[in-house]
Amino acid sequence: SIPWNLERITPPRYRADEYQPPDGGSLVEVYLLDTSIQSDHREIEGRVMVTDFENVPEEDGTRFHRQASKCDSHGTHLAGVVSGRDAGVAKGASMRSLRVLNCQGKGTVSGTLIGLEFIRKSQLVQPVGPLVVLLPLAGGYSRVLNAACQRLARAGVVLVTAAGNFRDDACLYSPASAPEVITVGATNAQDQPVTLGTLGTNFGRCVDLFAPGEDIIGASSDCSTCFVSQSGTSQAAAHVAGIAAMMLSAEPELTLAELRQRLIHFSAKDVINEAWFPEDQRVLTPNLVAALPPSTHENLYFQ
Amino acid sequence: GAMGQEDEDGDYEELVLALRSEEDGLAEAPEHGTTATFHRCAKDPWRLPGTYVVVLKEETHLSQSERTARRLQAQAARRGYLTKILHVFHGLLPGFLVKMSGDLLELALKLPHVDYIEEDSSVFAQ
């Protein structure tokens, strides 16, 4: 049966049998800035081009043991959520991965900046169709990272990022706080904000919308056919990147403002239990859960 | 995220140092009264002191970025400090990434074309 997260973002008409928009997102390239990935996993083989870009800090700790499957875990799962054959949102989207996070899931602002610059240069050298950049990472507020995101957005690139898993105001983190970036918080199958250990999804006025981010089934780097459940605002952001890819594939001329407006328009409204958020943040936090456009747009989104 | 709202630095730390046109004979000294600012991550464990992103003013050309980076290295060397230019940015933001002692920040903030300097910091998978 269809995983809960795909059901949640799917218009009712498409829930009958299985989630399968045959060519969703095929005109769009999604850049993923994350860990290394297992690009020949059955779920994503042929869909992800691993670029030669790598800018990561050394792993912490003298006894750190670099295990390939662990190094690839986060990125492989997210690539699967965006474009996986069976558990992906935009099954037609092609992806390019840049390694900016090490085997412990840690990177630097400077490495991320250089990665964003790499994408801009690639765009200039070989202009393609619409570009979506997925940034499933967060650090403290960074003026320079936000500025780079702003420049890339002004160059016509759609940036989607994780709100952060700190149960805190997303405005205190980057790139979540960058106004031009689509910032995504995480909700669960009960439309509750996701709790992650003692923390959970970030919130506040810098969040644009929420998306499924708990117990998300996706490609596991443990083996070439394995699946695993992961949770976090990265998974939520990956859903929105997939939805954005499908929207842009259907309407390649959409501006960032129009895309943002459509994402909000088609979202489920007022389904999130706001009691989870601090009282002063409830009015500031958007009560929106991302979804694909309804069946009236069949010709556009499910061609 | 969330367009149409003012930028809020939260508890982001900003240290403003007024530029002074003094030593080192700055051939391209900045206009009087402009300031370059220094920024670092408010979350101490995430800071990466010793690596800095020097962001130059918007219209700065690549050749000027390279020249500014070389100038910083030369001025640092005169003070007995080793520096390493790790990357020169162009395409998105003009500037460069430099590995250097924090002692050189005041010097770096006085360089021509400098808009602001940010200490590198960590980001994490979410």
Epitope: P22, Q38, S39, M49, R85 | -
Partner: antibody, heavy 115, light 109 residues
Framework: QVQLVQSGAEVKKPGASVKVSCKAS????????ISWVRQAPGQGLEWMGW????????NYAQKLQGRGTMTTDPSTSTAYMELRSLRSDDTAVYYC????????WGQGTTVTVSS | QSALTQPASVSGSPGQSITISCTGT?????????VSWYQQHPGKAPKLMIY???NRPSGVSNRFSGSKSGNTASLTISGLQAEDEADYYC?????????FGGGTKLTVL
């Protein structure tokens, strides 16, 4: 263009081993593994397993477990399939194909096991 | 796991349409979006005709189409031509491996 070129035909005695090679070209190697499929005379296709160019990981069909070994050599863009303790019912055409999707196939290698 | 079930043979006249079925279980055909169809002429390597249930690789005639309902996938060939005479195999993911159908011999009368 994307191509998989296999080694030539082999005749082996029962109990011996055979190693078939498959040289890949025209695409990004690490984006796909290699599947191995065999076809006995007059029979259908049988998936034998898969091997990764990215990290050398393997996924063998249950029937093959223990008797077969699949490897890759990224430096020469070549995948290998070795089958040990050959029996007469291993006589077949052995194909390599790109990835699990098997969208591109090698020309096939005939392996005859006969005393 | 056992092979997917296909009819041993089907036939049709030039210009007609034929459909080949491929029946599995919820653990293979019914559980995945990844059913493929291959055409194999005698003495040749198989050729991919349909992938991921409905998609046609570039270069494959639009006379070939795929579909799926529940645990059964189907390949339809419209406007039969003499060169379509061949063996056809379906293939599906299973949880950890891949499984082929037994094959269907298509005869163009």
């Amino acid at each position: 263009q994307v191509q998989l070129v296999q080694s030539g035909a082999e005749v082996k005695k029962p109990g011996a081993s055979v190693k078939v090679s498959c040289k890949a070209s025209g695409y990004t190697l690490t984006s796909y593994g290699i599947s191995w499929v065999r076809q006995a005379p007059g029979q259908g296709l049988e998936w034998m397993g898969w091997v990764s160019f990215y990290n050398g990981n393997t996924n063998y069909a249950q029937k093959l477990q223990g008797r077969g070994t699949m490897t890759t050599d990224p430096s020469t863009s070549t995948a290998y399939m070795e089958l040990r303790s050959l029996r007469s019912d291993d006589t077949a055409v052995y194909y390599c194909a790109r990835g699990y999707g098997m969208d591109v196939w090698g020309q096939g290698t005939t392996v005859t096991v006969s005393s | 796991q056992s092979a997917l079930t296909q009819p041993a043979s089907v036939s049709g006249s030039p210009g007609q349409s034929i459909t080949i079925s491929c029946t599995g279980t919820s653990s293979d055909v019914g559980g995945y979006n990844s059913v493929s169809w291959y055409q194999q002429h005698p003495g040749k390597a198989p050729k991919l005709m349909i992938y991921e249930v409905t998609n046609r690789p570039s270069g494959v005639s639009n006379r070939f189409s795929g579909s799926k309902s529940g645990n059964t996938a189907s390949l339809t060939i419209s406007g039969l031509q003499a060169e379509d005479e061949a063996d056809y195999y379906c293939n599906s993911y299973t949880s950890t491996s891949m499984v082929f159908g037994g094959g269907t011999k298509l005869t163009v009368l």
